[in-house]
Amino acid sequence: GCLTQLYENAFFRGGDVASMYTPNAQYCQMRCTFHPRCLLFSFLPASSINDMEKRFGCFLKDSVTGTLPKVHRTGAVSGHSLKQCGHQISACHRDIYKGVDMRGVNFNVSKVSSVEECQKRCTSNIRCQFFSYATQTFHKAEYRNNCLLKYSPGGTPTAIKVLSNVESGFSLKPCALSEIGCHMNIFQHLAFSDVDVARVLTPDAFVCRTICTYHPNCLFFTFYTNVWKIESQRNVCLLKTSESGTPSSSTPQENTISGYSLLTCKRTLPEPCHSKIYPGVDFGGEELNVTFVKGVNVCQETCTKMIRCQFFTYSLLPEDCKEEKCKCFLRLSMDGSPTRIAYGTQGSSGYSLRLCNTGDNSVCTTKTSTRIVGGTNSSWGEWPWQVSLQVKLTAQRHLCGGSLIGHQWVLTAAHCFDGLPLQDVWRIYSGILNLSDITKDTPFSQIKEIIIHQNYKVSEGNHDIALIKLQAPLNYTEFQKPICLPSKGDTSTIYTNCWVTGWGFSKEKGEIQNILQKVNIPLVTNEECQKRYQDYKITQRMVCAGYKEGGKDACKGDSGGPLVCKHNGMWRLVGITSWGEGCARREQPGVYTKVAEYMDWILEKTQSSDGKAQMQSPA
């Protein structure tokens, strides 16, 4: 299953499959997730080690048993790959690292006014993988405001150095934010020239293209089909690059297929997995396990659930079957691709779905009247769980926020439905940033069921929570995916990085905002919060957030939206925007429904009709 916990001051001994430099543990974890063999990782922050060569070291590890012995190492951080973690799987990494220079091949330098602009330039340059920016206070005047675009053979820095007044980060192309755009076309009977960066075996050009998309240096590819004239080159997928970023030449060639990486696509990237099953095909590789199962789909599920399994072959040979079950061969290789592909067999083959980010039809959890005042504009994909609940009567207007917690589930505030309990009048917009982008053609979700907490009473602050079941499940993308829920009765976690988002009023007597706003707000203890509300009881089912001096808060139109906190690199839905005395008033924190206190209720209500819990637990 999915394991999200991080181990502080711990280092996994042995099992090394690769090492690299990464700026933090979360990026190291992401590299582990996308490495075909990596199950575990250990990261050494700069503060944890004197050896300059090992600072920022990210060590990717494999283990036949799925675990390795942990040794104590002060400052080290270890953890698990996020394979099998559904929507948490993403190659997108937005963080900017202050005081850090990520080294690589500097291929472009320009003057820019901010680190955000530098990141944007990197995202819009086809070859840029990461960048460094010298701030206005950099010690050498001639380098100030320099934006260095970089790449490296592995896509990660060749070294990371602590350097004052330098800020570094990664391209946001994996966040589907590139302005370059992409070529979706597949070119039949055409071979591209230029530099081969890798060679793998794939059953078709589409798998080849997805591998190219997620390979750090692949810009385009050529695939040799299973009827290519040279037998040893059949099913070979050549991943390619060039100085210019495009093929310098292409040659008409029977039984070849070429195309481009989709990493520069805007708004949608392919999933980093291959779900198709190939009948009459055998995939060769190292044997992991053989099991008897009923049907090829069960074989694929078995492979997906066995975390080390990369691909499988389901054999229909009479000697491999007994009764209705046949042999399911679970296999792996060094690069995640088959070492041999054979056609015209009595087998069916396919890949593990462990890197599919749609996950199952579930809401995500972890084991372990009001708008935004004083906020700033959000950017695309920053809060992909945020939805806009709109009412269409004569006109259409935004009324509340909500949080996507599963393919078919939105969590919001019960008071959003005061006086508007009819599900037909509601439209739910997901994957949007600007309300002005909504036109009559913009797709929206309709409500199948509104489930208001049974103890909620109209115009009271208690039990202000409601679930919305959507008529049809939503697909997950970089811009539309769920937020993880906290564990039941989560009281031990101290959250220090919390944000409220919404399109609500930007002042008490204001108006709905066009661009989704965000504001960083500290949590306030219930005891402190209670002192600020002389008339109202702040219960253990509520959580408060706000600044002593006011100025930043949720407001009208933000109700039902998320209060999210980042802990160990993972965002969790801590609160639902509920109520407050005015907006952003001094000494009047916002009051939010505490989601952890309602986990039993959420789990009970999101159970499917067949009794299967719709709740996936990545921890």
Partner: antibody, heavy 116, light 106 residues
Framework: EVQLQQSGAELVKPGASVRLSCTAS????????IFWVKQRPKQGLEWIGR????????KYDPKIQGKATLTADTSSNTAYLQLSSLTSEDSAIYYC?????????WGQGTLVSVSA | DIQMTQSPSSLSTSLGGKVTITCEAS??????IAWYQHKPGKGPRLLIH???TLQSGIPSRFSGSGSGKDYSFSISNLEPEDIATYYC????????FGGGTKLEIK
């Protein structure tokens, strides 16, 4: 309209116990805290304690601990103050109040007289 | 335990005039002070909380100020219905009332 109706005056003997009631209307006591405050003749106000009727959690003034017991019955929307081992020092008006962080609305008070 | 020393214990003033009552806490109470008006035969009435925030429906003739350990409460343009006993209350750590100030008209 928010109201707190307190029970009538009590004349009790030293050493005895008494139970005072505070019945709420216009709101549900589960949604608030009920506080109790004492006022001795010609003296100031003293906080006795607080109950959360939703879960019966109580908090008392450490000086009064043992003397007073707070309870609540949500079905009748009523809170109670039980005073035990009464002495002349317990002769006072006892007020119930509702609120969150503070005593926002008060009852009219119940006079308890302890006399042989 | 936080003690609240309220002064004066009584004061006499003219209608239309202004009165000021002070309360000193034994420790810093972080502005968590409230002021109540108490008339005989009734329950006290909350006037001000968090040092200076007027409870809804309370006229602006009533005001409060202070910080740390020292706080004051004022009534300007005194009216006949203001005749009552006034109490301060700290709610930073549990609850402690001041001794009260009895306000009379000359």
């Amino acid at each position: 309209e928010v109201q707190l109706q307190q029970s009538g005056a009590e004349l009790v003997k030293p050493g005895a116990s008494v139970r005072l009631s505070c019945t709420a209307s216009g709101f549900n006591i589960k949604d608030t805290y009920i506080f109790w405050v004492k006022q001795r003749p010609k003296q100031g106000l003293e906080w006795i304690g607080r109950i959360d009727p939703e879960n019966d959690n109580t908090k008392y003034d450490p000086k009064i601990q043992g003397k007073a017991t707070l309870t609540a019955d949500t079905s009748s929307n009523t809170a109670y103050l039980q005073l035990s081992s009464l002495t002349s020092e317990d002769s006072a008006i006892y007020y119930c109040a509702k609120g969150g962080g503070l005593f926002a609305y008060w009852g009219q008070g119940t006079l308890v007289s302890v006399s042989a | 335990d936080i003690q609240m020393t309220q002064s004066p214990s009584s004061l006499s003033t003219s209608l239309g005039g202004k009165v000021t009552i002070t309360c000193e806490a034994s420790h810093d109470i972080n502005n968590y002070i409230a002021w109540y008006q108490h008339k005989p035969g009734k329950g006290p009435r909350l006037l001000i909380h968090y040092t200076s925030t007027l409870q809804s429906g309370i006229p602006s003739r009533f005001s409060g100020s202070g910080s740390g350990k020292d706080y004051s409460f004022s009534i300007s343009n005194l009216e006949p219905e203001d005749i009552a006993t006034y109490y301060c209350l700290q709610y930073d750590n549990l609850f402690t009332f001041g001794g009260g100030t009895k306000l009379e008209i000359k």
